[in-house]
């Protein structure tokens, strides 16, 4: 006879699954805040910085109340993939000024990657429909100058900070409904 059957697969507790995702998100939020503050100290920002290639912010007035778990996770995953790509780009093409933010930028990239894996796992455990594979994104053009790289860093970290706040708020709100 073959090996004895393994223990029956316990269906995951969605609240516990969400909890560990929220924990990772909050942790990444704190890292991002710290890194953004470090960037502001070294290269003070004047006003808001935007980058056209970044995802538009996920939340608008009233939208949080209507959130559903599949939509939040799918949107969050897509946005974080974009931010991961931007952080990788920043590390590669951001110029010598941004080297002063290492190894923190590398740590941020690794934690972002970990959160994305966690989201993927959560979606499969909750049997949510898996999004189709992402189409290859057009390559990001290198910054036109050292200052362009710094402005891009402000935009990327600022946008990621707000996206993670949206994620924590949305996920905790959804948890109260489970």
């Amino acid at each position: 006879p073959g090996p004895p059957p393994g223990p029956p697969r316990v269906s995951p507790d969605p609240r516990a699954e969400l909890d560990s995702t929220v924990l990772l998100t909050r942790s990444l939020l704190a890292d991002t805040r710290q890194l953004a503050a470090q960037l502001r100290d070294k290269f003070p920002a004047d006003g808001d910085h935007n980058l056209d290639s970044l995802p538009t912010l996920a939340m608008s007035a009233g939208a949080l109340g209507a959130l559903q778990l599949p939509g939040v996770l799918t949107r969050l995953r897509a946005d974080l993939l974009s931010y991961l790509r931007h952080v990788q780009w920043l590390r590669r093409a951001g110029g010598s000024s941004l080297k002063t933010l290492e190894p923190e930028l590398g740590t941020l990239q690794a934690r972002l990657d970990r959160l994305l894996r966690r989201l993927q796992l959560l979606m499969s455990r909750l049997a949510l429909p898996q999004p189709p594979p992402d189409p290859p994104a057009p390559p990001l053009a290198p910054p036109s100058s050292a200052w362009g790289g710094i402005r891009a860093a402000h935009a990327i970290l600022g946008g990621l900070h707000l996206t993670l706040d949206w994620a924590v708020r949305g996920l905790l709100l959804l948890k109260t409904r489970l």
């Epitope: 909890d19 942790s27 939340m59 007035a61 009233g62 949080l64 900070h161 707000l162 706040d165 109260t176």
Partner: antibody
Framework: EVQLVQSGAEVKKPGASVKISCKAS????????MDWVKQAPGQRLEWIGD????????IYNQKFTGRATLTVDKSASTAYMELSSLRSEDTAVYYC????????????WGQGTTVTVSS | DIVLTQSPASLALSPGERATLSCRAS??????????IHWYQQKPGQAPRLLIY???NLDSGVPARFSGSGSGTDFTLTISSLEEEDFATYYC?????????FGQGTKLEIK
Amino acid sequence: EVQLVQSGAEVKKPGASVKISCKASGYTFTDYNMDWVKQAPGQRLEWIGDINPHQGGPIYNQKFTGRATLTVDKSASTAYMELSSLRSEDTAVYYCARGELGHWYFDVWGQGTTVTVSS
Amino acid sequence: DIVLTQSPASLALSPGERATLSCRASKSVSTSGYSYIHWYQQKPGQAPRLLIYLASNLDSGVPARFSGSGSGTDFTLTISSLEEEDFATYYCQHSRDLPPTFGQGTKLEIK
């Protein structure tokens, strides 16, 4: 100096609505959430909800959903809380407070606005 | 919702003494190195003031005689040597889940 300055005391009749303002200064308004907290006489502090000024999305304590409405005017660095269908148990001091993104601790508070609901 | 219970309800001490205030949560508010508990001080007619965030971090401008500790469900605010201006009501608050909730407070009075 980082400051939150709230509008003055209000006396309202049951069934009416009240709208309180909270003007922020001394920091970048969109870098923090704005939270609202109720303190009724002899009761513990109660979180009403919060709003992210950058994106404008409020979330509410279920207890206040449907009666509290949180809004912001980014250009004026001002947050608002409107409470409708007032009843006597809404008599309280209402505070706005600056909330750390994603962590809900409140490091700067307004001076409070007293709302009295009485017929 | 998570319920926070503070003890004692009131405490009478003299300046120079050590004060130990307790806050117990109805379920754990800690997770992987983070404890989502915060402490505030409130004086009559004033707004609350943040003292400690995430269980043990002193907010800027708060004297070093204040400290926070604990994890899981049991947390403590300690004032190592009481000054006149420390006599007030102290609240704990959690932010582990939504909604954040507050304890009922501990009133610290002069003996």
